[in-house]
Every structure is written in structure tokens, then in C-alpha cells.
């Protein structure tokens, strides 16, 4: 009598998550009487996957009709495969008994599950940074299998090289995660810039997944300040202008001080955007020269995005009665950084 053989023809089977997996098994003889069982793994901790004799296995169906006695095909189909189903499956023949006696096992079929990576999520720095500073962006994607994966970073379509990538876990697992951190040097022109994390995997059929982050969330472009005096008006009033240019974000508070005393505070709001994404703002202050005996020191104090205030001062010469003055005069930047005054964003 020939020795019973349990034949599992495939050493390995690879299936996409969500699909069905067919695990093939045939026996060379129907003798002796006894059940066939499928297990995942070997040894005492093995997991029963299907028992042709009994039990309820909703995701597992026999490929051939198990009620046909001359059927020697014990292949099974497992539906709706997930990464958790990965492992080596064994078809095992038992002799009927109490308990059933294991006679012979197939060589095993390794089921690997091809699972797509999740959409990459890119997160930027918690606080804004200014031009010439380096900021870090992190890209994460999870749940993919097999482990091999390619991740690239781009800034405005140009590939970046300064990044570090880790795939976890290092050993064998049902699915994997990738985390990459890229270092990006900011420039003043980066308000409209974008970083892209691109993930390529065998399951994506050459159509990589992308995650994006806008540098507008990470950058702060501090304003330039310029204070100028317009011509003296006939009513002895001087129009002094504070031009705040090229700043981002819009959150900005401007305070006028006359001889150190707060004259007016304004918040920027609904400003038109420059081509590069920055904003400009101009504020005017009318100074009544005849109401002052001495020269008036005007200060334009700007607090941008919660940063320490920046000032520009300008002296209006009262003694000179500059009624004939025709040209604008630019103020000097005092360079004084006064105590932060937080203003609302406009």
C-alpha cells in the first residue's frame, strides 16, 4: 500500500488585501478514514483555519465539493484577505480516533498579503520659522505589505535629498509603517511653496500616493518698515505714512506713538495678497503741528505674528514751520524692540 502523501503544490501565494486566497491541497489516498484540517503555523500554538469535519468557518470555503467521497482535493478559499491573514498554512490529514491522530502534513504554503499603504500624511513644524532657517516635515504612511517601499520628497517639483526614512518594524510583520523626516531651508519666496511626500509601492501599480504640506503653514516673513512724511498741509497738519511691506502671515498689529504715548492701534485685515503671497499695509497719521510747541517724535510700532515689536521713529520738526517742504522724508529705523503687545490677526 502506497504511503499517504499530502501535497501542497505552491510554496507561496501572494494576494491583494480584500481579495480571496486559494490554498491548494490534494491527498494521494483516501485511506485511512479521517478528517483533513487546515492550520496556520506549526507546533502547539498553531491556529485552526478550517476543519472539513465540523465547525463554522464563515470566511473559508472548500474549492471542491467535500461531500464527494472520491474527491481528493482539499483546497480551500479564504475570502476578504487582510494583512492579519499572512502566514504559513498547512493542510493536515488525520486518522479518525479519540482524539484524531495526525498522520501527515503538507509542506505548507506561505500566504503573503499585498496591502496598500495609507495616504501619506505630511505634518510640518509646530511653530513658524523665518527665511534661511531649516524646518522639518514628517511624512507617515501605514498598513502596507510587503515591506519594500520607496519614499521621495519634493519642494515645488524639485526632489529633496536631505531626509531620513525608517520602515517599522525591522523584522517580519503582517504590515509595515514608514516615517520620513525632511529638512527644508526656507526662503522669503516660500509662502506659496509646497512640499510633497511621494510613496511608491508594488500594490500601487506605478501610481504613487502623495501627501502635501504648504510652507505657508511653516513660514513667517517679517515686514519691512518705512516711515515717511508727506508735504505740510495748509491747515498745519503733517501726514506721516508707515509702510509695512512683504510680510506673512497677515496677523499684524500697528501702533502709532506720539512722543511715546499711544495715539492709535490698528489690526491688519482683508489685505490684498502680493504675487509671492506676502502682504503690504500702509497706515497714515495726521499730526497737527500748531498744537505742539516742540518737535514731535512719531513711532510706528509693528507687532507681527506674536513676535517682539519692531519700531521705526520719525521726528516732525515743529520749530522749522516747514510749510514750504515739498519732498517726502524717510524716517530712520530706531532699532528699538519694545515689549510685545499682542494684537488680533486681520
Amino acid at each position: 500500500e502506497e504511503e499517504l502523501q499530502v501535497i501542497q503544490p505552491e510554496k507561496s501565494v501572494s494576494v491583494a488585501a480584500g481579495d480571496s486566497a486559494t490554498l491548494n491541497c490534494t491527498v494521494s489516498s483516501l485511506i485511512p478514514v479521517g478528517p483533513i484540517q487546515w492550520f496556520r503555523g506549526a507546533g502547539p500554538g498553531r491556529e485552526l483555519i478550517y476543519n472539513l469535519k465540523e465547525g463554522h468557518f464563515p470566511r473559508v470555503t472548500p474549492v471542491s465539493d467535500p461531500t464527494k467521497r472520491n474527491n481528493m482535493d482539499f483546497s480551500i478559499r479564504i475570502s476578504n484577505i487582510t494583512p492579519a491573514d499572512a502566514g504559513t498554512y498547512y493542510c493536515v490529514k488525520f486518522r479518525k480516533g479519540s482524539p484524531d491522530v495526525e498522520l501527515k502534513s503538507g509542506a505548507g504554503t506561505e500566504l503573503s498579503v499585498r496591502a496598500k499603504p495609507s495616504a501619506p500624511v505630511v505634518s510640518g513644524p509646530a511653530v513658524r520659522a523665518t527665511a534661511e532657517h531649516t524646518v522639518s516635515f514628517t511624512c507617515e504612511s501605514h498598513g502596507f505589505s510587503p515591506r519594500d517601499i520607496t519614499l521621495k520628497w519634493f519642494k515645488n517639483g524639485n526632489e529633496l535629498s536631505d531626509f531620513q526614512t525608517n520602515v517599522d518594524p525591522a523584522g517580519k510583520s503582517v504590515s509595515y509603517s514608514i516615517r520620513s523626516t525632511a529638512r527644508v531651508v526656507l526662503t522669503r519666496r516660500d509662502v506659496h511653496s509646497q512640499v510633497i511626500c511621494e510613496v511608491a509601492h508594488v500594490t500601487l501599480q506605478g501610481d504613487p500616493l502623495r501627501g502635501t504640506a504648504n510652507l505657508s503653514e511653516a513660514i513667517r516673513v517679517p515686514p519691512f518698515l518705512e516711515v515717511t512724511q508727506q508735504s505740510m498741509r495748509a491747515d498745519n497738519q503733517v501726514n506721516v505714512t508707515c509702510q509695512v511691506t512683504k510680510f506673512y502671515p497677515q496677523r499684524l498689529q500697528l501702533t502709532w506713538l506720539e512722543n511715546g504715548n499711544v495715539s492709535r492701534t490698528e489690526m491688519a485685515s482683508a489685505l490684498p495678497e502680493n504675487k509671492d503671497g506676502t502682504y503690504n499695509w500702509t497706515s497714515w497719521l495726521l499730526v497737527n503741528v500748531s498744537a505742539h510747541r516742540d518737535d514731535v517724535k512719531l513711532t510706528c510700532q509693528v507687532e507681527h505674528d506674536g513676535q517682539p515689536a519692531v519700531n521705526k521713529s520719525f521726528s516732525v520738526k515743529v520749530s522749522a514751520h516747514p510749510k514750504e517742504q515739498g519732498s517726502n522724508t524717510a524716517a530712520e529705523n530706531t532699532g528699538t524692540n519694545e515689549r510685545n503687545i499682542y494684537g488680533g490677526s486681520g
Epitope: I31, G34, R69, K96, G97, S98, D100
Partner: antibody, heavy 118, light 107 residues
Framework: EVQLVESGGGLVQPGGSLRLSCAAS????????MHWVRQAPGKGLEWVSA???????YYTGSVKGRFTISRENAKNSLYLQMNSLRADDTAVYYC????????????WGQGTMVTVSS | DIQMTQSPSSLSASVGDRVTITCRAS??????AAWFQQKPGKAPKSLIY???SLHSGVPSKFSGSGSGTDFTLTISSLQPEDFATYYC?????????FGQGTKLEIK
């Protein structure tokens, strides 16, 4: 339709012989373990004999050496040759098919009556 | 040989009743226990195999349970056609053996 039909029963004297036949239809008899079960009048069921797919044979103690189970694949038939019959062999004899992987009985014939009496 | 002891040997019940018949094996038989129904003058009919699996065409009012040495057959709601004799059987090893039967009679 899967069916088993027994024949060959009748009245026989003690010490005599009888050959029971079981004709199978709707399936290939040689692919299944096949059995004979008997039931004495007013009594319970008693398993008598079996033949496996490999031709291996099994008997209950009281019939060993007297009864022989066999099959003829060409005729899709099962047989029970009964020799040295005794009064306590009197019973209805049923031909039974053993189920797929564990040999659980699934299909029964209608039975044939064997009476051993002088 | 493995002995199968069935109880009770007879049972009176009414239509609509739920009845349970038990069977004990003299040694462990895994779940290789079967149940049969027989009506007078007829061949037995297979009801349950591997302790709890219903043969095709058997109504779900019949259920079986147990493993090792103790097994039960339950009929959830008796109908007139269910009054018959019921047998348990072990088929783990030769010689296969039956219980002595339980006669279910109408009250």
C-alpha cells in the same frame, strides 16, 4: 438519486448459507466505506460488517469466520456471504453507506429479512 | 468494545414539547457520535453525525451536542411525525456500536 436496494433474504435452516446483495445507484460504491447493519425482531440496531475503499474488511465478534463482506465494482454492488447461520442471526439486514470523511452512516437501504429457523 | 448507554429507554411527551435524549460512551469517542430515527417497519434515517452536524434534509428542530463521552439529542418542538425510536451510535472505532434505543411515545 442515491439509493441502496438489498435483496437475497429469506428463510434458511440453521447451519445453512445465504448471500445478501446490495445494489447501489446514484454514486460509485467503491468510493465509499460500506456497511451491513442488522436488527433482530423487536430489538435494537447492531453493526455487522464493513468494507473499506481499499478492500479492508471488518466484522463484529459474533459473525467473524462465518460472514464475508465483498463488493463487485463492475456491478456497483455490495455482498454479504453468510455461512453457518444460527437462529440468533435472524434479523432485517440493512446495507448502509459510510459518510464522506469520517464514515458516518448517511444512506440506508430498505432492508432484507433473513430468518434462520428449522 | 465501546458500549453506548442511552437514556431514557422510553419517553412520553406531547406535541409541542421539547425533549432531550442522552447517550454515554464507555470511553471517549471524540465527537464521532451519530443519531438515527426509526419508525416501525421502516429503515433507520440518519439525523446527526459528528455529534452536532445535521444530515442534509433534516429539519433544524433536531440538534445534537456533546464530545468525549456524553452526548445529547434534542427535539425542540415535537410534531406527530417525530414519535419514533431514536438510536445513538459511536463510529470512532470498529466494531461500531449503537445504544439500545429510546422509544418516544405520544402522551
Amino acid at each position: 438519486e442515491v439509493q441502496l436496494v438489498e435483496s437475497g433474504g429469506g428463510l434458511v435452516q440453521p447451519g445453512g448459507s445465504l448471500r445478501l446483495s446490495c445494489a447501489a445507484s446514484g454514486f460509485t460504491l467503491s468510493s465509499y466505506d460500506m456497511h451491513w447493519v442488522r436488527q433482530a425482531p423487536g430489538k435494537g440496531l447492531e453493526w455487522v460488517s464493513a468494507i473499506g475503499t481499499a478492500g479492508d474488511t471488518y466484522y463484529t465478534g459474533s459473525v467473524k469466520g462465518r460472514f464475508t463482506i465483498s463488493r463487485e465494482n463492475a456491478k456497483n454492488s455490495l455482498y454479504l456471504q453468510m455461512n453457518s447461520l444460527r437462529a440468533d442471526d435472524t434479523a432485517v439486514y440493512y446495507c448502509v453507506r459510510g459518510g464522506v470523511w469520517d464514515d458516518a452512516f448517511d444512506i440506508w437501504g430498505q432492508g432484507t429479512m433473513v430468518t434462520v429457523s428449522s | 468494545d465501546i458500549q453506548m448507554t442511552q437514556s431514557p429507554s422510553s419517553l412520553s411527551a406531547s406535541v409541542g414539547d421539547r425533549v432531550t435524549i442522552t447517550c454515554r460512551a464507555s470511553q471517549g469517542i471524540n465527537n464521532y457520535a451519530a443519531w438515527f430515527q426509526q419508525k416501525p417497519g421502516k429503515a433507520p434515517k440518519s439525523l446527526i453525525y459528528t455529534a452536532s452536524s445535521l444530515h442534509s434534509g433534516v429539519p433544524s428542530k433536531f440538534s445534537g451536542s456533546g464530545s468525549g463521552t456524553d452526548f445529547t439529542l434534542t427535539i425542540s418542538s415535537l410534531q406527530p411525525e417525530d414519535f419514533a425510536t431514536y438510536y445513538c451510535q459511536q463510529y470512532v472505532s470498529y466494531p461500531y456500536t449503537f445504544g439500545q434505543g429510546t422509544k418516544l411515545e405520544i402522551k
